[in-house]
């Protein structure tokens, strides 16, 4: 078909045609994380705004309950940024004495929750050391890539201390995915 | 539609059908910065390449003065990366010297400008603390996301200190938008 | 055409209408790295998984001896992150006794391959100084843009030591690509 | 505690819908997945279908397809099962199943018999 | 429909002894699971993904393969391992468990 003007009484496709404007899509922006209770071993989901300011749901791409839920499968980009802020870590006093230590850390994880797999899917992983010393510090971390999901799949962020979690600004710390 | 042979006389789409290559797209790359006044309490905007090397605008995508003009109404995926390097920051002496401080920082935000709104939007922002001790330090702040854009919106990156942008290479320092 | 129904006979379109789920795409992750020969002056390419788990290769997008090969001229959104880890660096005792050095850093390159050019093409960069005290340490560096590619084109992933990087989880270390 | 409670009618009339409930509690519904299995009498598992309750997507065996219906009610934890036009081969063993998370859970199973 | 081949379909074993059930998929599955029944129970998940044991399941247990060909092992038989075992693969629509392999002591 290279080059060719499109012609529907001969046209050949593979797949249906489909609309680009009708496809999920969602962006989801930071807002003030209410403490709740999470499993031992399981770092804690963020919760998301889906409606205001920058924030948006489309095409049947639905959030709930710290979800984006994908609506049909497909493949899919997938990404978040967690900006992270703190005090002083331990680590960094103990360092101080001149003493190595394993340092703190700062992760952030996208997980697929499917009914065809009975444990939660990682699918996307930024972790980093955090070791400063004597100063309030602040970092991001982003992810995104490109993912084969089924219908009914779910995703969450998750990370590694919700209480530093950066949540004054939409800009700071999101969450999106949209079809391709 | 799912597994059905393309046949335009009963195909049924929600909206127009578009050819991808006709999407309005760019990837602009860093250029060496010239020193310009900008606003007191706004971060000065970068200024790009758009032709040469790996930069490229299409389907009317134009880049002028500093700002990408969005041509089209629709969802886009917008992206930047700006290395930054530096010296060592005077917050690295200070807390040589035992004292606390509020650490230097290097921040990337992408902004949004609209006719028919007289605040700039920032679309997302990669803010991150610098406190390196005696030595010189470069990094990058990567940022993207999709975000639903009016025709004849205009981006722009910005950045809070326009001389520890590394402006040596095309690949290190980039900004991009495409419509979905 | 905007907000007119699909109607085939009238319809214009500037290029050939396009299958999304035809498209080649690839998502690779890590897998533990054989030591191998690189030459003087050139970064050790990565190489990857492109079937287990979360990897993939479809649409005649084909992964072989480190490169992807991109099957049909376009734009492609092409991205990569690189977890790395290590020991305290060289750079840190230095700067303990109090002398400034130029630090360690890691770097990744997203490098284009192309038999009509005889260099190498850096597509995108991402390098960071690591300058850490008395610990061990891990970081992700993320890239991600558009290129205009052409068939034949062959792409990889350059780092700056191949011993630094983790390989332990296909969700911290990954590769991909798309034809938007 | 995780449990999932299965209950209705222990007997249905051929040609009548069988209609069953599992009501779940110490987790959240939204979360996970629902699946109803069911086992004849001296026959192995059959996977019937389920449904993922914050979106209400449900996918079914085929071979019920045109009989099966699954629904859930998140504010009462509830989801319920509709079988219609019964026959004496859809006796058996109805469990609820989560899944979605590790470990799966299991309810106890309600004995369903269709007879006149 | 993905069928399941479950062989044996019923195996006699004394305590102590390795007992293997495999499980054939008709085309290609990513993931393999095995349960347990007991009389009257439900069924309870042992292994997930083919080859990781559930939590609290003993570690006699055991599941390996790939593809279409998969294992179930018990590397010493317990007399509280009398059941029926089953494979399930989760990926086809239906979902299709193996016709169930009984297991009893000698």
């Known amino acids: 078909l290279k080059g060719q003007e499109f012609a529907p009484s001969h046209q050949q496709v593979y797949a249906p045609l489909r609309a680009d404007g009708d496809k999920p899509r969602a962006h989801l922006t930071v807002v003030r994380q209410t403490p709740t209770q999470h499993l031992k071993n399981q770092f804690p989901a963020l919760h998301w705004e889906h409606e205001l300011g920058l924030a948006f749901t489309k095409n049947r791409m639905n959030y709930t309950n710290k979800f984006l839920l994908i609506p049909e499968s497909g493949d899919y980009f997938v990404y978040s940024q967690v900006t992270f802020r703190g005090m002083t870590s331990e680590c960094s006093e103990i360092r101080q004495a001149g003493r190595p230590n394993k340092p703190d850390s700062i992760t952030v994880v996208i997980t697929k929750v499917t009914d065809s797999y009975p444990e939660p899917t990682q699918l996307l992983m930024g972790t980093k050391s955090v070791c400063e010393v004597g100063s309030n510090w602040f970092q991001p971390i982003y992810l995104g890539a490109m993912f084969s999901l089924q219908e009914g799949d779910k995703l969450m962020v998750n990370v590694s201390d919700i209480s530093l979690v950066d949540y004054t600004k939409e800009d700071k710390t999101f969450f999106g995915a949209f079809l391709l | 539609l799912k597994g059905q042979e393309f046949a335009p006389s009963h195909q049924q789409v929600y909206a127009p059908l578009r050819a991808d290559g006709d999407k309005p797209r760019a990837h602009l790359t860093v250029v060496r910065q010239t020193p310009t006044q900008h606003l007191k309490n706004q971060f000065p905007a970068l200024h790009w390449e758009h032709e040469l090397g790996l930069a490229f605008t299409k389907n009317r995508m134009n880049y002028t003065n500093k700002f990408l003009l969005i041509p089209e109404s629709g969802d886009y995926f917008v992206y930047s990366q700006v290395t930054f390097r530096g010296m060592t920051s005077e917050c690295s002496e200070i807390r040589q010297a035992g004292r606390p401080n509020k650490p230097d920082s290097i921040t990337v935000v992408i902004t949004k400008v609209t006719d028919s709104y007289p605040e700039p939007t920032q679309l997302l922002m990669g803010t991150k603390s610098v406190c390196e001790v005696g030595s010189n330090w470069f990094q990058p702040i990567y940022l993207g996301a999709m975000f639903s854009l009016q025709e004849g919106d205009k981006l722009m990156v910005n950045v809070s200190d326009i001389s520890l942008v590394d402006y040596t290479k095309e690949d290190k320092t980039f900004f991009g938008a495409f419509l979905l | 055409l905007k907000g007119q129904e699909f109607a085939p006979s009238h319809q214009q379109v500037y290029a050939p209408l396009r299958a999304d789920g035809d498209k080649p795409r690839a998502h690779l992750t890590v897998v533990r790295q054989t030591p191998t020969q690189h030459l003087k002056n050139q970064f050790p390419a990565l190489h990857w998984e492109h079937e287990l788990g979360l990897a993939f290769t479809k649409n005649r997008m084909n992964y072989t001896n480190k490169f992807l090969l991109i099957p049909e001229s376009g734009d492609y959104f092409v991205y990569s992150q690189v977890t790395f880890r290590g020991m305290t660096s060289e750079c840190s005792e230095i700067r303990q006794a109090g002398r400034p050095n130029k630090p360690d850093s890691i770097t990744v390159v997203i490098t284009k391959v192309t038999d009509s050019y005889p260099e190498p093409t850096q597509l995108l960069m991402g390098t960071k100084s690591v300058c850490e005290v008395g610990s061990n340490w891990f970081q992700p560096i993320y890239l991600g843009a558009m290129f205009s590619l052409q068939e034949g084109d062959k792409l990889m992933v350059n780092v700056s030591d191949i011993s630094l990087v983790d390989y332990t989880k296909e969700d911290k270390t990954f590769f991909g690509a798309f034809l938007l | 505690q995780v449990q999932l409670q299965e209950s209705g009618p222990g007997l249905v009339r051929p040609s009548q819908t069988l209609s069953l409930t599992c009501t779940v509690s110490g987790f959240d519904m939204q979360s996970t997945y629902m699946h109803w299995v069911r086992q004849r009498p001296g026959r192995g598992l059959e996977w019937m279908g389920r449904?993922?309750?914050?979106?209400?997507?449900?996918k079914y065996n085929p071979s019920l397809k045109s009989r099966v219906t699954i629904t859930r009610d998140t504010s009462k934890n509830q989801v319920s099962l509709r079988l219609s036009s019964v026959t004496a081969a859809d006796t058996a063993v109805y469990y609820c199943v989560r899944s979605g998370g590790l470990p799966d859970v299991w309810g106890q199973g309600s004995l369903v018999t269709v007879s006149s | 429909d993905i069928q399941m081949t479950q062989s044996p379909s019923s195996l006699s074993a004394s305590v102590g002894d390795r007992v293997t059930i495999t499980c054939r998929a008709s085309s290609s599955v990513s993931y393999m699971y095995w349960y347990q029944q007991k009389p009257g129970k439900a069924p309870k998940l042992l292994i997930y993904g083919a080859s990781n044991l559930a939590s609290g399941v003993p570690s006699r247990f055991s599941g390996s393969g790939s593809g279409t060909d998969f294992t179930f092992t018990i590397s010493s038989l317990q007399p509280e391992d009398i059941a029926t075992y089953y494979c399930q693969q989760w990926e086809g629509n239906p979902r299709t468990f193996g016709q169930g392999t009984k297991v009893e002591i000698k």
């Open positions: 449904i993922e309750p914050a979106g209400g997507h449900t």
